[in-house]
Structures are given as structure tokens and as C-alpha cells.
């Protein structure tokens, strides 16, 4: 057992080294480890094959370090890994697209507060078991096409607190099991009419605190299971172009936030849902 760590065998073989001031992944981690806790240290780099010997590893925590680089092969051989927490590593900024390849059993991936500026092509390829994906509080500006395509079992996708400016047509392709999509506190000004086409099981959609002045109801049509919708804190323009959204909200059986109008001036602060159809005039 490495000097700064505590190792024990029950109920899972565990190597626990949190908050020890470690500057590197310690050598001598027992190969039988099923759980490795390395959070709260000063580790800046995860070299290739750091945990290759740990074939039985199911939980790996590296959150709250100072990670600036993770080698593409850092997690090679971890076919049984279920939970990987890399959050709170603000200097990370980017992750090689091959980093998570081979993690076919992974069900929870924490990448929040990592300073991520982009999601490289194929970053989440093959993560068929993933259920929870934490990407909030990064610096993401775009959602590339098919980024999440392989995540057919994903139920929770947290993308809030980024700098995303639009939701393109293929951004959420393949997310057939998604239950919660949190996109609040971004800069979203445009949602493609087919952006939510695969989200037939979505129950919660947060779009509040964005830059939306309009939302095509065609985008909302596929959301058959939607129960909770938040659209507040957007610069909604309540003219004739808002009529389709107004009509959709009248029919919506679930629970929704207020949709306060920004323009025209005479309707500023009024809730779109509570307006009459003939209030929505002038284009």
C-alpha cells in the first residue's frame, strides 16, 4: 500500500489516499483495487496506463486535484470501471478524444468544473452503459453533432453553466433514454427545430437563463414524456411569432415556469402563458 494511502479489503478492495498533498499518482497501488480515492490532492498529470494493473477497478476518484493533462491511455484496461470522477480540475481545459475509449461499463462520469472548452469528436464513443454525465460549469461553447450518439442509456445530462450559444440539429442524437436535460445558464439563442427529436423519454428540460427570444414548437413536439419545463430568464419576444409557443404552453399538461416577456415594451414582465392570443400582435 502506498505510504500516503490506507488500503483495506472489505467490502471492496480499496486504496484511499485523499487530501494527502500527493503531486503524482502514487506507485504501488495494489493491483486488486476495486476502488481508488485520490481526490483532494495536487496531482497535475495522469500518465498513460496509470491504473493498467487494476483490472477490477470500479470506482476512481481524481476530483479536486490540479490536473492539467490526462494521457489518452491513462485509463487503458479499466473495462470494469463504473464511476470516474474528474471534476474540479479547472486547469484541465481539454480531454483527448480517446481518453474514455474502452470504458464500456462506465455509468457515471464527472467532468464538471474542468475548464473544458470543447468536446472533441468521439470523446464519448462506446460509453453504452453511461447513465449520468456531468459537464456543467465548464467553458463549452458548442455542442458538436453526434457528440452523445452512443449514449443510449444516458438518463441525466448536465450541461448548465457553460457558454453554449446554440443547440444544433444533431446535438442530442441517440439519447433515447434521457430523463433530465439541464441547459440553463448558458448563452443559447437558437434551438434547431429537430434538436430534441430523439428525446421521447425526456421528463425535465431546463432552458432558463439563456438568450432565447423564440423557441420553435417543432422542437418541443417530440417531447412526449415532458413534465417539467423551465423557460424563465430569457429575452422572450411576445409578438405574433410567439403564438405557436403560447398555444403549445396552453396545451402543456406538465409543470412549467413563468415565461416573462422582454419585448414589446408594453408586455415587458408579463407571463406569456397568461396572455391572450390577441395580445401577441405585430411582427
Amino acid at each position: 500500500c502506498p505510504g500516503a494511502c490506507v488500503c483495506y479489503n472489505e467490502p471492496k478492495v480499496t486504496t484511499s489516499c485523499p487530501q494527502q498533498g500527493l503531486q503524482a499518482v502514487p506507485v504501488g497501488i495494489p493491483a486488486a483495487s476495486q476502488r481508488i480515492f485520490l481526490h483532494g490532492n495536487r496531482i497535475s498529470h495522469v500518465p498513460a496506463a496509470s491504473f493498467r494493473a487494476c483490472r477490477n477497478l470500479t470506482i476512481l476518484w481524481l476530483h479536486s486535484n490540479v490536473l492539467a493533462r490526462i494521457d489518452a491511455a491513462a485509463f487503458t484496461g479499466l473495462a470494469l470501471l463504473e464511476q470516474l470522477d474528474l471534476s474540479d480540475n479547472a486547469q484541465l481545459r481539454s480531454v483527448d478524444p480517446a481518453t474514455f475509449h474502452g470504458l464500456g461499463r462506465l455509468h457515471t462520469l464527472h467532468l464538471d468544473r474542468c475548464g473544458l472548452q470543447e468536446l472533441g469528436p468521439g470523446l464519448f464513443r462506446g460509453l453504452a452503459a453511461l447513465q449520468y454525465l456531468y459537464l456543467q460549469d465548464n467553458a463549452l461553447q458548442a455542442l458538436p453533432d453526434d457528440t452523445f450518439r452512443d449514449l443510449g442509456n444516458l438518463t441525466h445530462l448536465f450541461l448548465h453553466g457553460n457558454r453554449i450559444s446554440s443547440v444544433p440539429e444533431r446535438a442530442f442524437r441517440g439519447l433515447h433514454s434521457l430523463d433530465r436535460l439541464l441547459l440553463h445558464q448558458n448563452r443559447v439563442a437558437h434551438v434547431h427545430p429537430h434538436a430534441f427529436r430523439d428525446l421521447g423519454r425526456l421528463m425535465t428540460l431546463y432552458l432558463f437563463a439563456n438568450n432565447l427570444s423564440a423557441l420553435p414548437t417543432e422542437a418541443l413536439a417530440p417531447l412526449r414524456a415532458l413534465q417539467y419545463l423551465r423557460l424563465n430568464d430569457n429575452p422572450w419576444v411576445c409578438d405574433c411569432r410567439a403564438r405557436p409557443l403560447w398555444a403549445w404552453l396552453q396545451k402543456f399538461r406538465g409543470s412549467s415556469s413563468e415565461v416573462p416577456c422582454s419585448l414589446p415594451q408594453r408586455l415587458a414582465g408579463r407571463d406569456l402563458k397568461r396572455l391572450a392570443a390577441n395580445d401577441l400582435q405585430g411582427c
Epitope: 490506507v6 472489505e10 467490502p11 480499496t14 476502488r35 470506482i59 457515471t108 449520468y132 448536465f158 433530465r180
Partner: antibody, heavy 119, light 107 residues
Framework: EVQLVESGAEVKKPGASVKVSCKVS????????MHWVRQAPGNGLEWMGG????????KHAQKFQGRVTMTEDTSTDTAYMELSSLRSEDTAVYYC????????????WGKGTLVTVSS | YVLTQPPSVSEAPGQRVTISCSGG??????VNWYQQLPGKAPTLLIY???VLTSGVSARFSGSRSATSASLAISGLQSEDEADYYC???????????FGGGTQLTVL
Amino acid sequence: EVQLVESGAEVKKPGASVKVSCKVSGDTLAELTMHWVRQAPGNGLEWMGGYDPESGETKHAQKFQGRVTMTEDTSTDTAYMELSSLRSEDTAVYYCAADRRHWGSLDVWGKGTLVTVSS
Amino acid sequence: YVLTQPPSVSEAPGQRVTISCSGGNVGSSSVNWYQQLPGKAPTLLIYYDTVLTSGVSARFSGSRSATSASLAISGLQSEDEADYYCAIWDDSLNAWVFGGGTQLTVL
């Protein structure tokens, strides 16, 4: 900082129902996994039920099956627990508690709501 | 209670005390420890058997054996007087199971 703020104390008659609310602030309810735990006067903690991330369903302790309803309104960041057919032994402090990181621990707790059942 | 804890323990200030948790499915489950100060809500101290919650004093520590878990508190202080509960998520019951609680008195 995440806080769970519960509704005020309630006094109920036997046979009645009570609905306790739990409002999330500093975070959104959709990010949390919510549970309910109660504590009768002078007794220990007793889990009533909560969201099971693996199945995506709300699970209840066998003891409360059919009497408890747990709901969430993520549009207002409020969770609710309703207990029906109240009896005197349901007198307790009712806590909402949440798992913030999907780590399998109840790491945020409300201050609790005292429910008194008395005729 | 399915999980067994000593009902009470007491020790002098500055000393070390250990609270055990056994029974039920402790042998195959990860244990969490909660502290409940008088008149307050519980707070999480330790999860995954040994991992200390952020902000909790390093005087608290968790340990494991094949059939039980233990919470140790060293350098006892008067503000440690509280009830301490162990808990597991029991996969067979699909439920959180709590121990009966241990009342710690600092003499």
C-alpha cells in the same frame, strides 16, 4: 451552497394526511437525488423512501408502502412527501435529504418538519 | 434495527473513542456515518467507509473489517457530544438502513 428548506410544523388528527414540502436553493432539484427520513421523538433515523438512480423509480420502505407518496416538481425545485392514514406513532420530525453527486450518500439535509398526530 | 451500534459511549476530553456498526448487510455494503448534534438535523461525516466529507475534521476517521465498520474520534472535544448513526444502502432491500444510533458523551 445547497440548502433544503422544509415547510412548517403540522398538527394532524389520526386518519388525516400530511404533505411536507422541501424547497431546494443554491442548486436545482433536477441535479439531486432526493430521499425522505423520519425520526420519532427520542428514536433513531428511519428511511421512508426516495429516488433510486439505478431504476429511475421512487422506492419506499416496505413499512410505508401504500401510505406514502413522494413527488417532485423540478419546475419549482420543490419535493413533496405525503403520508396518509396518520396514527399517533407517525409523530416525528420528517427530513428531506439529498445525494448531490450520485455518490451513494445523503450529503445534504433539511432542518426537518415536526408532524404531531394527536386527537 | 438491522444494523447494531452500541447505544452509548463516553470518554474524557482529549481521548479517543470508537463506535462500531455491524449486522445486516454491512459485510457487503459501503458504510456512511452521520453526526446529529442535539436538536439539529444529521450531517454526513464519512462515506464509502473511510472517505471524510469535505470540511470535516481529520479527528474523525472510518475503518472496515470483513463484517463491521467503525467510526473513530480522536482528541475528543465537548462539541463532539452528539448521536452518531451508521447507514448502508441495502441492495437486497432496495432501501437505506440506519443503525440505532450511538450517543456520545464527553465526560
